[in-house]
């Protein structure tokens, strides 16, 4: 007997689709051998319709696929747009068609619903609304209108024009009688249940002259859409439930091991902790449709998801729903990248963001995930030279190292910078990743002065002290602007005396600005890098003022950070404290900025917490 197993009988209707799962013993030979679906002929042969090696018969072109799941020992044949011609006997199997490693499947496709012996067929999805139309003649216009449901041999009254409503339909049914011109009444049933399915009879009048109309109500469970996404990638569930539930609370839930469908996110503000930082429920349109983006897909995210509408914000009987079965492919094209990056107050982080290397010319973005309400991700910076105002001078998006990775540097960190950030592009929406920035105890490794004032026409020298741990790194100074940080010449002044217990490998590297002009005002960064990979940075704001006295200016660290034998050259500069120092012009008060670049359409924005690797802010 064959070890292959599947459904022996599949029944469906015209225009529908089927998904046939065939099971095989997952030996290494079976996992890699050819899988096929063939139709048995009258004379015993079996003609291949589709196989795992890419063959698709002309009969199946554009409407069928075969997907192998070697880790489960299954393959799935999806066939859409069924017609009665598809009815017949089939085999799903492994190897070659005639070898016998196969399973027989009978597929029967019946005629789609239509008008059969004066019965109007209504086919409606679970949770949706049906309107049963009931015509009548003029002589019954003033008489009682009623709808019955056939239960076994007996018709049971469901609703009538005198105000009766069967308790099973309370709160979800109404009878509408059209204007005098139209000889028609309608019964509208909302929040359809599976138990509503069956034969109905509508009637106008109660005597032998009454008008009757038969109706057959078929209530369908939604067929789950199969969704295959990569580990660490993202998925978007588009949920269109219809305008009739536009003002009802929406939800996305995941069927769990119990009977329940656990809420993942809903419009009432609930969000499952496992999705913190990596989910957005996009604002719904007027027609009630909405979408949910989940990023940083994990193995455990696989499963059946339902979206729906109900005032409770969770699945209830009569909720209109849509269903998906999410598979998470562990052989992911999306590379591992750190999902947690740590920095210290006053210090910096350098975040590596992966993107689809085929889309090197795409616009890169970085946004801050906000959990309030349904979640949003307002943009902070992009690769086209835009930086959100509050982040000027301390945030930069660099195309380096390129070839599938870009870098985001954020410095002058404060505890308020802790949170989840998303890397994304305007290209492949599956390549959205997340990183969590954590602010930990400690002091910045690079030491620079606080705000610095330069004098027009004079020379300014700004020091940056690098501890010995960065001895093998390239050290640089650059001038920050919206498009990045342009490298500047700098001088190595020898070992630094700013570090206790640090040997000759520490370094003092100075930035010199000769003949200072107004254009020199702005933010300057000193930092370390290894090739195209960036490490820590420190920022200094240089203000430019009119000449007061002649000479050049050297700027030192404040007394608090000076080595015991180091002379403080200019005690007029404020002491560096263990906190971020920012441009005082931006620091007076942080106002809520209604920023035009904030994502209203969060579907472009999204995250990766697929691995739990962590990355410190100080080095790669």
């Amino acid at each position: 007997k064959s070890p292959i197993f599947g459904p022996e009988e599949v029944n469906s209707v015209e225009g529908n689709s089927v998904s046939i799962t065939c099971y095989y013993p997952p030996t290494s030979v079976n996992r890699h051998t050819r899988k096929y679906w063939c139709r048995q002929g009258a004379r015993g042969g079996c003609i291949t319709l589709i196989s795992s090696e890419g063959y698709v018969s002309s009969k199946y072109a554009g409407r069928a696929n075969l997907t192998n799941f070697p880790e489960n020992g299954t393959f799935v044949v999806n066939i859409a747009q069924l017609s009665q011609d598809d009815s017949g006997r089939y085999k799903c199997g492994l190897g070659i068609n005639s070898r016998g490693l196969s399973f027989d499947v009978s597929l029967e496709v019946s005629q789609g619903p239509g008008l059969l012996n004066d019965t109007k067929v209504y086919t409606v999805d679970l949770g949706r609304t049906v309107t049963i139309n009931c015509p009548f003649k003029t002589e019954n216009a003033q008489k009682r209108k009623s709808l019955y449901k056939q239960i076994g041999l007996y018709p049971v009254l469901v609703i009538d024009s005198s105000g009766y409503v069967n308790p099973n339909y309370t709160g979800r049914i109404r009878l509408d009688i059209q204007g005098t011109g139209q000889l028609l009444f309608s019964v509208v049933i909302n929040q359809l249940r599976l138990s509503d399915a069956g034969q109905y009879l509508c009637q106008a009048g109660d005597d032998s002259n009454s008008n009757k109309k038969n109706a057959d109500l078929q209530v369908l469970k939604p067929e789950p859409e199969l969704v295959y996404e990569d580990l660490r990638g993202s998925v978007t569930f588009h949920c269109a439930l219809g305008p009739e539930v536009a003002n009802v609370a929406k939800f996305l839930c995941r069927q769990s091991s119990g009977e329940n469908c656990d809420v993942v996110v809903n419009t009432l503000g609930k969000r499952a902790p496992a999705f913190e930082g990596r989910i957005l429920l996009n604002p719904q349109d007027k027609d009630g449709s909405f979408s949910v983006v989940i990023t940083g897909l994990r193995k455990e995210d696989a499963g059946r998801y339902l979206c729906g509408a109900h005032s409770d914000g969770q699945l209830q009987e009569g909720s209109p729903i849509q269903a998906w079965q999410l598979f998470v492919n562990e052989e992911s094209t999306i590379p591992r990248s750190p999902t947690v990056v740590k920095g210290v107050a006053g210090g910096s982080v350098a975040v590596l963001c992966p993107y689809n290397r085929k889309e090197s010319k795409s616009i890169k973005y970085w946004c801050l995930w906000e959990g309030a309400q349904n979640g949003r991700c307002p943009l902070l910076v992009d690769s086209e030279g835009w930086v959100k105002a509050q982040y000027e001078g301390r945030l930069s998006l660099l195309e380096e190292p390129g070839n599938g990775t870009f870098t985001v540097i954020l410095n002058q960190l404060t505890s308020r910078d802790a949170g989840f950030y998303w890397c994304l592009t305007n290209g492949d929406t599956l390549w959205r990743t997340t990183v969590e920035i954590k602010i930990i105890e400690g002091e910045p490794n690079l030491k620079v002065p606080g705000n610095v004032t330069a004098v027009l026409g004079e020379t300014l020298k700004v020091p940056c002290h690098f501890p010995c741990k960065f001895s093998s790194y390239e050290k640089y100074w650059c001038k920050w602007n919206n498009t990045g940080c342009q490298a500047l010449p700098s001088q190595d002044e020898g070992p630094s005396k700013a570090f206790v217990n640090c040997d000759e490998n520490s370094r003092l590297v100075s930035l010199t600005l000769n003949l200072v002009t107004r254009a020199d005002e702005g933010w300057y960064w000193c930092g370390v890098k290894q090739g195209h990979f960036y490490g820590e940075t420190a920022a200094v704001y240089v203000a430019v003022e009119e000449r007061k006295a002649a000479g050049s200016r050297d700027v030192s660290l404040a007394k608090a950070d000076a080595a015991p034998d180091e002379k403080v050259l200019d005690s007029g500069f404020r002491e560096i404290e263990n906190k971020a120092i920012q441009d005082p012009r931006l620091f007076a008060e942080e106002k809520a900025v209604a920023d035009t670049r904030d994502q209203a359409d969060g579907s472009r924005a999204s995250v990766d917490s697929g691995s739990s690797e962590e990355q410190g802010g100080s080095s790669r």
Epitope: E8, L126, S195, K221
Partner: nanobody, 129 residues
Framework: QVQLVESGGGLVQTGGSLRLSCAAS????????VGWFRQAPGKEREFVAA??????????YAADSVKGRFTISRDNAENTVYLQMNSLKPEDTAVYYC????????????????????WGQGTLVTVSS
């Protein structure tokens, strides 16, 4: 929760027929698959048949040992699944259990007990020779 109650078991002679019923109540709107399993005295529970519905499609499964003899069907309006058992043999003697689950297609292998979250108490079928 979903409650399942089996009925229709009893004593029958070899070659005879029985129809088992599995009536579901509770949150039945979320049931997408129903299976029948059986456990003979001193043996492990084994798969007999299953039905999965998805949209307008229905998928029926049967174990090799009952193919051609047992048929699974359902009455959606009554929330009942039936197992029509014909040409019964003494080796069919067992307690028959009905199981249900909200996972339809794709989902766990229908033959695996772990693929079902709700179980009935069972009904005894005895086939005498």
């Amino acid at each position: 929760q979903v409650q399942l109650v089996e009925s229709g078991g009893g004593l029958v002679q070899t070659g005879g027929s029985l129809r088992l019923s599995c009536a579901a109540s509770g949150r039945t709107f979320s049931v997408y698959r129903v299976g029948w399993f059986r456990q003979a005295p001193g043996k492990e529970r084994e798969f007999v048949a299953a039905v999965i519905w998805s949209g307008a499609s229905t998928y029926k499964y049967a174990a090799d040992s009952v193919k051609g003899r047992f048929t699974i069907s359902r009455d959606n309006a009554e929330n009942t699944v039936y197992l029509q058992m014909n040409s019964l043999k003494p080796e069919d003697t067992a307690v028959y259990y009905c199981a249900a689950d909200p996972l339809g297609l794709p989902g766990p292998d229908v033959r695996v007990e772990g693929g079902y979250r709700h179980w009935g108490q069972g009904t005894l079928v005895t086939v005498s020779s």
